[in-house]
Structures are given as structure tokens and as C-alpha cells.
């Protein structure tokens, strides 16, 4: 691979062969020694005779105890300070020192960017000991570089607690245009000007940009990176991209698509869920919102009867959900319903119309005239009334329900008696003696339970007290019935 | 086959609350009211009180002040709470069921012996 | 309030013997009246109801009688497990109250 070095001082050498320090063209390793540890940094062995020394970071030695002689301050031989490479390619550079044998237990570690490499990096450690001092070279290859891979790369050895630093590898790796910031896919108001960003970045720089609507440039002159591209309105929907170049070449952007707002299609499939006397529950499926959210949507209700005016009702509700529950409908009444939206644009078109029938409501009226008496001889009490006059709507009377509560001694207890549509009496069991019992009836159809009557209280003396007097419903202005025995 | 199964502190000290629970199994809660009764030692029986299953309450006038009875019907359990306990509050404490028009109790839990003592 | 009164408190008999068990009320108690039996350490068990009607699984030699304010319970003959507390309990005012007992125990 041909790699680029930029430096400002060639490094000194100090073996044969490959230098320490040096750029490398090639991807052997430097020196196949039996002392080598890939992966780790790796210990100290034997001497070897120093090389020149480097004045930057350095460690001062104390005096030895054998010869009282003054060892040479320790530091990183210079090496290759800049590496440029295109993407994809591999790489190998390395750092040498050369440390007295007195020395032990020496690391060497490799960082980037202030943060310690660890782990399985393919760093290797080579050792070239002599007789008194070692030289280390430190080699640190990558195979198939990135952009991830630039930075600023530097060895670091620990002396008796005091650390050297190498001079810093500048690793520069150069492709294509990379893009920081594309064109995003846009929904704009026909006519209406908008703003396109596109961003690329090197190395290697200057990147400058192209912008391509529907396969033709829009620019002739390129713009440095970043771009904005105003577009002052579009009637129809358009495809945009942009180009960025350098000296390695282009890449293109994705292509994205601004949309032009326009109204909603009308909803679809408008269907009934449940209808009750006076409700019906319906849902559609929305139809194409026309590039801008769905705000809200109408639902219209016509009632279908030769008889009425053929006014709309109109309910507004939310868009979502896709559901909506109509009220306050006639009973037992047949209905035409349908469905229209709005965007920020405008409302749809209706929805196709449909049917839908409200069912037979629940008696409007209670039972007339509820007279009450006890039957004491077989501890009954007596219930009689009349049929209400209901509406046609409230569909076929099924029977009634009576309620009696029955309170004592400050207990109380309601029970419930269902009766034919046959019948305008009953008999129901004393529950309690000594006790008043009130009693209320409502008239029921397939369609509900209507209200109940005024209550009409009966009290039921001790057992033995007889007394036949009955209760009846009050005529109109009186509130609460009480029989006094 | 329905059943109920009461429990609940057996040893107070007097001025705590007395709390039992029953629970029925196997049978519907609905449309029967259920009641709490207790038998002091070597005595006769006294209803304390009932709840229907749609929480509607009704006491004994002679402990309504003391009594609380409550119902849990997504466990099918109902619960007494008798506050302000004394030595007379001693007793085995039944929970029954009854039918809600006719107040016979044809159900009964095993009884809970409570005590009251200093 | 309905008082119920038991007589007589205890009650000594042989099995095969006749037993018979009366509850005076203080007011009149229509029939709203039933019977229970409870046996050492065991809940009440529902013998009759409304004064006359025997409760599901109750043997036939258990009858009830009366109306108003005086009532019976009788058992034909006695077997050994019928040896126990016999309550009186009445429904027809609120609240509702129990007698205090009849023991019936084995000669």
C-alpha cells in the first residue's frame, strides 16, 4: 500500500534494516526475535547498547551503584509524524526507546486521542537486549483503515513511577465524501418556498456540493459544504439530491421526495359496531391523508323518513380513533351516516353513504296508578297498576319490574320482581313484619328498563295486626305516599 | 362445592380492632347476602351484620356504632372490622352465607375464635 | 325486637326416643321461623325453615310445627349424632334473633 509521510525530523537510526520509528510500506513485521508479545505490552530482558537520545519528554536516571557513572536521560526516538492513507488500506507504525538493563519491569502502552488502547489491538512489543541496554521497538498495524481510525496515536513507557511519552503519529485517512447532514423527505404547500441542507466532510477538504432535482444539477457552480438550497415552490412532487466532491472523488446522497399537500381522499369502508335505542357506534378506515396530518373529521347523519325535513346532523370529532359513537338519535328510526376529514389543506370528500337503524328504546313512562295493600292472612302484599302509554319507538312491552325496599329497625333491603307484559299485578312475600315496604314498577321492552314509578309505601305492622287499608300512587302535587295504620 | 374459608388475628388486647376476612370458593357471590355472626363462650348466636355483593350493608342496631363490613367481589371475599374491642367482644366469629329474600343461613365458615384480653 | 325463648334448656333422652324441642317468641313470628343444630367445635347447620320446611339433605325424622308465637321442633327417633345444641331463629322483624339454645344429650 503507498502511504504518505509528512514529518519535520527524521528519525535516527539505529539498527540495520527497518527503522525505528520509521514509515512503513510494507506489511511484515520488523524483526522476528524470540522475545516478542503481540496484543500486551511486554517486559524488559537483556542490554543493548543506546541509541541517540531525544530531549523532549524524557526521565533522568540516578546514579548507578556499580560504577557511580551517570546514565543518559530516557526517551522516544523521533519518528514519522504524519501518515496520510486512503480508506480501506493498512497501515503499520511504530515507536523505539532504548532503556538501561537496571531497569525492570517496563511497559509500553499505546493511546489514542488520550485514551488508553486496550484489548485486541495488534500492537507488538520487540526486544533487542545488549549488554547494558535494551532497545524496544513498539509496531502497531491496522488492517483496512476507517475514518474511525484518525487521530493522534502515542507510545507511553513507565520508569520507576515516571512516565515517557512519544512524539504524537498523526494518522489521516482520506475517502469519499462523507455525509454529516442529507436532505430529508419534505410535505410543502404547492407554491411555497422551503429549505434543503446537505453536509459532507474529507478528509481530504475542501468537499463542495451539487444539488440534482429529478436526475438535472440545479446549481452550475458548486457550493462549499454545508449547502442550503432554497426552493422557491414546486406545483408537483419532485425528487432532490446532492453531490459532494473532493479530491478522492463523489458520492450522492439519497434521493428524497417533497410532496405536495393536498386535500384528503374520503374515508373508506365506513361500518356499524353497535346500535342502541338512541346510538349508534360506527368506525371508518382513513383515506389518504394527502401528505399533511389528518386534523379532524365530520360525521353526517341524515335521517331516512319521507316524514322529515332531510336535515344533516353534523358531529365533529377527533381523527384518531378511526371511531366514533352518534347520540341523542330517535329510537327505532333508520339513518344514512357518512364520513368526511379535513387536513390542513381542506376537508375530503363524504365517504360513501350507509345504512343504519337505531333499535326499540327503553318506555319513556312508568306504570300509572300503583296502588299497594297487604294480604295479611297469607302474608303477601297486593301490587296492581296500569299499562303505560308508550311511544311506538319504545318498541313491544315485555313485562315489568318491580322493586321493594323493605326498611327496619334501621336495616333496609331492596329485591327486584320481574313480571309478564300479561299482567297489572303481583303478590309479593312480606319479607319482614314490622317493617315498611316500598314499592316502585317500571314498565320494560326489549329495548331497556323505563323509569320507575313514584314510590308507594306500605307498612307492615307485627304479625297479627290486621289491616287492609291500601297505598296508591299520589295524585299530582303530592310527594310521598305513606299508608298510617 | 361451595365453601368458606374465614381468617383473621385470634388475640387482642382491648380498645384494638378485631379484623376477619372469609372468602367463598367455588359458588357465585352474587344474589345472596353474607353475614357475620358470632357465639360467645357457652352462649347463644347474634348476627353482627350483612353485605351484598354489590357492597349494600346492614348492621345490628346494637353494634352498628363499632361495626364495618366490607366486600372485595374480584376475590370473592368480604371482611369485618369491630373496633373499640372489650372481653365482651369474646366470642367464635362465623361468616355465613344467606339468600337475599328469605335470611335463612344455609352456609357457614368453621368460626374464628377471638379473644379479648389484657 | 323478637325475643326467643327455648325450653328446656337441656334435655336428656335415649336414642330411639321421641324428642321434642319448643320455641316461645315474644311477639308473633308468622312462620318466619327456623331451626339449627350445632354439634361441638362446628358451625350452626339449617335444619327447617319457615316453621314446617325441612332444608336440603335433612333427614325426615326432623319436623317442625307452629305459627305465631309458639313453635316445635320434634325428632321421631333419635339417632346418636342427633345429640346436640338445637337454636331457634326468627326473620320476621329486624334484627333478626336467635333463641339460646336447647342441649340435647344422651341419657
Known amino acids: 500500500a503507498i502511504t504518505e509521510a509528512r514529518e519535520e525530523a527524521k528519525p535516527y537510526p539505529l539498527f540495520p534494516g527497518p527503522l525505528p520509528g520509521s514509515l512503513q510500506t510494507d506489511h511484515t513485521s520488523l524483526l522476528s526475535l524470540p522475545h516478542t508479545s503481540g496484543y500486551q505490552p511486554a517486559l524488559m530482558f537483556s542490554p543493548t547498547q543506546p541509541g541517540r537520545p531525544y530531549t523532549g519528554n524524557v526521565a533522568i536516571p540516578r546514579v548507578t551503584s556499580a560504577g557511580s557513572k551517570l546514565l543518559p536521560p530516557l526517551a522516544f526516538k523521533h519518528t514519522v509524524g504524519h501518515i496520510i492513507l486512503s480508506e480501506h488500506k493498512d497501515v503499520k507504525f511504530n515507536c523505539s526507546i532504548s532503556v538501561p538493563n537496571i531497569y525492570q519491569d517496563t511497559t509500553i502502552s499505546w493511546w489514542k486521542d488520550g485514551k488508553e488502547l486496550l484489548g485486541a489491538h495488534h500492537a507488538i512489543t520487540q526486544f533487542y537486549p545488549d549488554d547494558e541496554v535494551t532497545a524496544i521497538i513498539a509496531s502497531f498495524s491496522i488492517t483496512s483503515v476507517q475514518r474511525s481510525d484518525n487521530g493522534s496515536y502515542i507510545c507511553k513507557m513507565k520508569i520507576n513511577n515516571e512516565e515517557i511519552v512519544s512524539d504524537p503519529i498523526y494518522i489521516e485517512v482520506q475517502g469519499l465524501p462523507h455525509f454529516t447532514k442529507q436532505p430529508e423527505s419534505m410535505n410543502v404547500t404547492r407554491n411555497t418556498a422551503f429549505n434543503l441542507t446537505c453536509q459532507a466532510v474529507g478528509p481530504p477538504e475542501p468537499v463542495n456540493i451539487f444539488w440534482v432535482q429529478n436526475s438535472s444539477r440545479v446549481n452550475e457552480q458548486p457550493e462549499k459544504s454545508p449547502s442550503v438550497l432554497t426552493v422557491p415552490g414546486l406545483t408537483e412532487m419532485a425528487v432532490f439530491s446532492c453531490e459532494a466532491h473532493n479530491d478522492k472523488g463523489l458520492t450522492v446522497s439519497k434521493g428524497v421526495q417533497i410532496n405536495i399537500k393536498a386535500i384528503p381522499s374520503p374515508p373508506t369502508e365506513v361500518s356499524i359496531h353497535n346500535s342502541t335505542a338512541h346510538s349508534i357506534l360506527i368506525s371508518w378506515v382513513p383515506g389518504f391523508d394527502g401528505y399533511s396530518p389528518f386534523r379532524n373529521c365530520s360525521v353526517q347523519v341524515k335521517e331516512v323518513d319521507p316524514l322529515s325535513n332531510g336535515s344533516v346532523m353534523i358531529f365533529n370529532t377527533s381523527a384518531s380513533p378511526h371511531m366514533y359513537q352518534i347520540k341523542q338519535l330517535q329510537a327505532l328510526a333508520n339513518y344514512s351516516i357518512g364520513v368526511s376529514c379535513m387536513n390542513e389543506i381542506g376537508w375530503s370528500a363524504v365517504s360513501p353513504w350507509i345504512l343504519a337503524s337505531t333499535t326499540e328504546g327503553a318506555p319513556s313512562v312508568a306504570p300509572l296508578n300503583v296502588t299497594v295493600f297487604l294480604n295479611e292472612s297469607r302474608d303477601n302484599v297486593d301490587i296492581r297498576w296500569m299499562k303505560p302509554l308508550t311511544k311506538r319507538q319504545a318498541g313491544e312491552l315485555v313485562g315489568y319490574r318491580i322493586s321493594h325496599v323493605w326498611q327496619s329497625a334501621g336495616i333496609s333491603k331492596e329485591l327486584l320482581e320481574e313480571v309478564g307484559q300479561n299482567n297489572s299485578r303481583a303478590q309479593i312475600s312480606v319479607q319482614v313484619h314490622n317493617a315498611t315496604c316500598t314499592v316502585r314498577i317500571a314498565a320494560v321492552t326489549k329495548g331497556g328498563v323505563g323509569p320507575f314509578s313514584d314510590p308507594v309505601k306500605i307498612f307492615i305492622p307485627a304479625h297479627g295486626w290486621v289491616d287492609h287499608a291500601p297505598s296508591s300512587t299520589p295524585a299530582p302535587g303530592n310527594a310521598d305516599p305513606v299508608l298510617i295504620i | 362445592q361451595v365453601q368458606l374459608q374465614q381468617w383473621g388475628a385470634g388475640l387482642l388486647k382491648p380498645s384494638e380492632t378485631l379484623s376477619l376476612t372469609c372468602a367463598v370458593y367455588g359458588g357465585s357471590f352474587s344474589g345472596y347476602y353474607w353475614s357475620w355472626l358470632r357465639q360467645p363462650p357457652g352462649k347463644g348466636l347474634e348476627w353482627i351484620g350483612e353485605?351484598?355483593?354489590?357492597?349494600?350493608?346492614n348492621y345490628n342496631p346494637s353494634l352498628k356504632s363499632r361495626v364495618t363490613i366490607s366486600v372485595d367481589t374480584s376475590k370473592n371475599q368480604f371482611s369485618l372490622k369491630l373496633s373499640s374491642v372489650t372481653a365482651a367482644d369474646t366470642a367464635v366469629y362465623y361468616c355465613?352465607?344467606?339468600?337475599?329474600?328469605?335470611?335463612?343461613?344455609?352456609?357457614w365458615g368453621r368460626g374464628t375464635l377471638v379473644t379479648v384480653s389484657s | 325486637e323478637i325475643v326467643l325463648t327455648q325450653s328446656p334448656a337441656t334435655l336428656s333422652l335415649s336414642p330411639g326416643e321421641r324428642a321434642t324441642l319448643s320455641c316461645r317468641a315474644s311477639q308473633s313470628a308468622s312462620n318466619y321461623l327456623a331451626w339449627y343444630q350445632q354439634k361441638p367445635g362446628q358451625a350452626p347447620r339449617l335444619l327447617i325453615y319457615?316453621?314446617?320446611n325441612r332444608a336440603t339433605g335433612i333427614p325426615a325424622r326432623f319436623s317442625g310445627s307452629g305459627s305465631g308465637t309458639d313453635f316445635t321442633l320434634t325428632i321421631s327417633s333419635l339417632e346418636p349424632e342427633d345429640f346436640a345444641v338445637y337454636y331457634c331463629y326468627q326473620r320476621s322483624q329486624w334484627p333478626i334473633s336467635f333463641g339460646q339454645g336447647t342441649r340435647l344429650e344422651i341419657k
Open positions: 355465613a352465607r344467606a339468600l337475599s329474600r328469605y335470611w335463612y343461613f344455609d352456609l
Open positions: 353485605i351484598s355483593h354489590s357492597g349494600s350493608t
Open positions: 319457615d316453621a314446617s
